[in-house]
Amino acid sequence: SSSPTSSASSFSSSAPFLASAVSAQPPLPDQCPALCECSEAARTVKCVNRNLTEVPTDLPAYVRNLFLTGNQLAVLPAGAFARRPPLAELAALNLSGSRLDEVRAGAFEHLPSLRQLDLSHNPLADLSPFAFSGSNASVSAPSPLVELILNHIVPPEDERQNRSFEGMVVAALLAGRALQGLRRLELASNHFLYLPRDVLAQLPSLRHLDLSNNSLVSLTYVSFRNLTHLESLHLEDNALKVLHNGTLAELQGLPHIRVFLDNNPWVCDCHMADMVTWLKETEVVQGKDRLTCAYPEKMRNRVLLELNSADLDCDPILPPSLQTS
């Protein structure tokens, strides 16, 4: 919806030294980077699907919404958006689908108004622990970020470093306690097998947490107690088998929460009894009447809300002497 006011660079490509100097001087009022569209009225710059390999240096100082989607940025270095004067108005930055595989420490420094950051659909093999905090201090200056969108940032298996992807992401979220003000965190579609137990305790301002379309099997060691004002917890399309009493009690104790649990392979055996009882009583689960059993085979597609204790049995474990091969 933003209309281009100028899509020609103020500097010709035959004078690259000038282009690099532009970050140290005020951009011209009507300047718009090459291959971008700018609307001063909407405070918006769009450099979309242009195969850019680096962030344009000559971004207009008025920019509040910056779209750099569908490019080939590969690496986001420290101070990638640092300018003189700084981009003091930049509030929303979308870098999704730009083939980023490395985000370095301090990549988003000198953006004092940055509230929304979207790095989705980038194969982030190397996300610095200090990508968002900017420094390796044990307590960093608070980040202004309120929304952090990190959906589908898992790199292909063969491009992953020799470390836990979950651990790498969590280290970046927790470094320097910089993201204490974060209200929305989206981590959907990242093949997460587990959620490190310390991550939620250190993000007390979270209102919306999206963990959908991962591979979470259990929430046994995850505590939601600190997320006192959590409003939405998206756990659809995971590998959850059952929610245990501790988790159920914590969720019930959060007065503003809505929980989304569709499309999990619920195991309807004796361990499911507490969850079924809770589901029948609670109002916090959205679409709870759609939840169905996946296992055991005899229970497949049964609606959880329609089960009673007699339906939920566990086959007795035979002593070794009675087991057959």
Epitope: A92, R115, Q116, V146, E147, R183, R184, R207, H208, T228, H229, E231, S232, G253, P255, H256, R258, E283, Q286, G287
Partner: antibody, heavy 115, light 107 residues
């Protein structure tokens, strides 16, 4: 910052219904919960209910059950509160308040019920 | 419903004074206690949520404390612009309920 702008003052007869609207902007960081609170002249605050705008789930104060209906239109980021079978003691300023802890409030809509 | 009893109902203090308001819930509300400021003819504003967390943009002279059923709101140094009515509110157990309000005036 979240801004909430409510519809204008209304004068209604007893037995009639009133529908108040609340338009949210600065929406990106707003809450999914929209609460409705009323305040009779010179009195305190009374919570009427809330709606979760993403799925339309509502919680109502039992005092108003059967008389109040809360709805939301996500496409235009607007919430509505309709109160039916109005009585003279429903005369009050009606506020929408966004957030679990009622973080941001609209400017209020005066509803006067008088024959 | 949870009853919220606020005291005093009104108070008069000088600029620079420390002002304290208390709120008692009829049952444990697990720290889900908020404080609102309302100036005449205006909508309420959230100052403090979850007992002691300052809402964005609220001056640090406002603070809150407490647990269980007993909660306290403090203005460390009263300013002329703090003249208003202050309400406590519970958002732990539906329906949410409010205290009756404390009107703060300047001596």
């Amino acid at each position: 910052q979240v801004q909430l702008v409510q519809s204008g003052a209304e004068v209604k007869k007893p037995g009639a219904s009133v529908k108040v609207s609340c338009k949210a902007s600065g929406y990106a960081f707003s809450s999914s919960w929209m609460n409705w609170v009323r305040q009779a002249p010179g009195q305190g605050l009374e919570w009427m209910g809330r709606i979760y705008r993403e799925d339309g789930h509502t919680n109502y104060n039992g005092k108003f059950k059967g008389r109040v209906t809360m709805t939301a239109d996500k496409s235009i980021t607007t919430a509505y509160m309709e109160l039916s079978r109005l009585r003279s003691d429903d005369t009050a300023v009606y506020y929408c308040a966004n957030g679990g802890a009622m973080d941001y409030w609209g400017q209020g809509t005066l509803v006067t019920v008088s024959s | 419903d949870i009853q919220m009893t606020q005291s005093p109902s009104s108070l008069s203090a000088s600029v620079g004074d420390r002002v304290t308001i208390t709120c008692r819930a009829s049952q444990d509300i697990s720290n889900y206690l908020n404080w609102y400021q309302q100036k005449p003819g205006k909508a309420p504003k959230l100052l403090i949520y979850y007992t002691s967390r300052l809402h964005s943009g609220v001056p640090s002279r406002f603070s809150g404390s407490g647990s269980g059923t007993d909660y306290t709101f403090t203005i460390s140094s009263l300013q002329p612009e703090d003249i208003a009515t202050y309400f406590c509110g519970n958002d732990n157990t539906l329906p949410w309920t409010f205290g009756g309000g404390t009107k703060v005036e300047i001596k």
